[in-house]
Amino acid sequence: APTSSSTKKTQLQLEHLLLDLQMILNGINNYKNPKLTRMLTFKFYMPKKATELRHLQCLEEELKPLEEVLNLAQSKSFHLRDTKDLISNINVIVLELKGSETTLMCEYADETATIVEFLNRWITFCQSIISTLT
């Protein structure tokens, strides 16, 4: 059974992940972002089901494409810290949260998503899991 300290650690990691994803989304949605139209042409893939921490495997598998699209707007459009570092940090958190005991084959939904829909989906996921922990 999870201890209160492990629950607290999980909650803090989810909050960190949530803040990183929200920061990216805020940067993209910034009204000054001239890259939004271009960024929206890139397709992202969503999980059929995302209700447990192990489903973060689906986020992990889309982090490289996410980094590529963020690189399109790194310097001028929104002020993220180095994209590579940001994605790397997210990756570390995701790996810790999902655990390595069970290797899940992610099941993806048939329909694709824009970067905005993709980020919103994972923000909602984080918020949902955090609410069950508190």
Epitope: E68, L72, K76
Partner: antibody
Framework: QVQLVQSGAEVKKPGSSVKVSCKAS????????IHWVRQAPGQGLEWMGW????????NYAQKFQGRVTLTADTSTSTAYMELSSLRSEDTAVYYC??????????????WGQGTLVTVSS | DIVMTQSPDSLAVSLGERATINCKSS????????????LAWYQQKPGQPPKLLIY???TGQSGVPDRFSGSGSGTDFTLTISSLQAEDVAVYYC?????????FGAGTKVEIK
């Protein structure tokens, strides 16, 4: 149809700079990124970087960072690649290229004819 | 950076025979979301720019003869010319088209035996 037409061959002295142009036609230059790839004589292909002509955003390969400058002039549908502090190893054919479609950044489907840059004292 | 290792360096094949070129990447090029492998194959003839033959590991570019086919997944890929023609003499390159910087294999020179 999509066409990329590059400027002519150049002979340059070591330490100088070269500026190669790439004129796009058959599509709006702001629709997609323009990439630059080089090929030394008898060697393989090496990606140098891309520019987004819409806003001048660039992404350079680490190897060329600080020596290459990519620019674009949307009024003439032309992209430029300037390489400074030339050395003999920069002798190569320089290509501009465009991706297959605008739904991913690569691969390159449309290529300029290439510009030979010779660096010699 | 992803390293692309191509083999063999050169290949001599009789006209009408099959030519096979291999490419190995140092990281998986499979994007599981769409089950696409971000690998492309190019043909380059002397004095010409590269020509895209195959993308997504196995999709033929428009106008490319169907004797050219691509296969493989993850880290191991193959370009096959089912029946070599005289006009196929060229250097062939693989390209990982997944992550910046995009990286090419060193090339395979195909000649007629």
């Amino acid at each position: 149809q999509v066409q990329l037409v590059q400027s002519g061959a150049e002979v340059k002295k070591p330490g100088s700079s070269v500026k190669v142009s790439c004129k796009a036609s058959g599509y709006s230059i702001t629709d997609d990124l323009i990439h630059w790839v080089r090929q030394a004589p008898g060697q393989g292909l090496e990606w140098m970087g891309w520019i987004d002509p819409e806003d001048g955003e660039t992404n350079y390969a680490q190897k060329f960072q600080g020596r290459v400058t990519l620019t674009a002039d949307t009024s003439t549908s032309t992209a430029y690649m300037e390489l400074s502090s030339l050395r003999s190893e920069d002798t190569a054919v320089y290509y501009c290229a465009r991706s297959l479609d605008s739904t991913w950044i690569y691969p390159f489907a449309y290529w300029g004819q290439g510009t030979l840059v010779t660096v010699s004292s | 950076d992803i390293v692309m290792t191509q083999s063999p360096d050169s290949l001599a094949v009789s006209l009408g025979e099959r030519a096979t070129i291999n490419c190995k990447s140092s990281q998986s090029l499979l994007r599981r979301g769409n089950q696409k492998n971000h690998l492309a194959w190019y043909q380059q003839k002397p004095g010409q720019p590269p020509k895209l033959l195959i993308y997504d590991a196995s999709t033929g570019q428009s106008g490319v003869p169907d004797r050219f086919s691509g296969s493989g997944s993850g880290t191991d890929f193959t370009l096959t010319i089912s029946s070599l023609q005289a006009e196929d003499v060229a250097v062939y390159y693989c390209l990982q088209s997944y992550i910046t910087p995009p990286t090419f294999g060193a090339g395979t020179k195909v000649e007629i035996k």
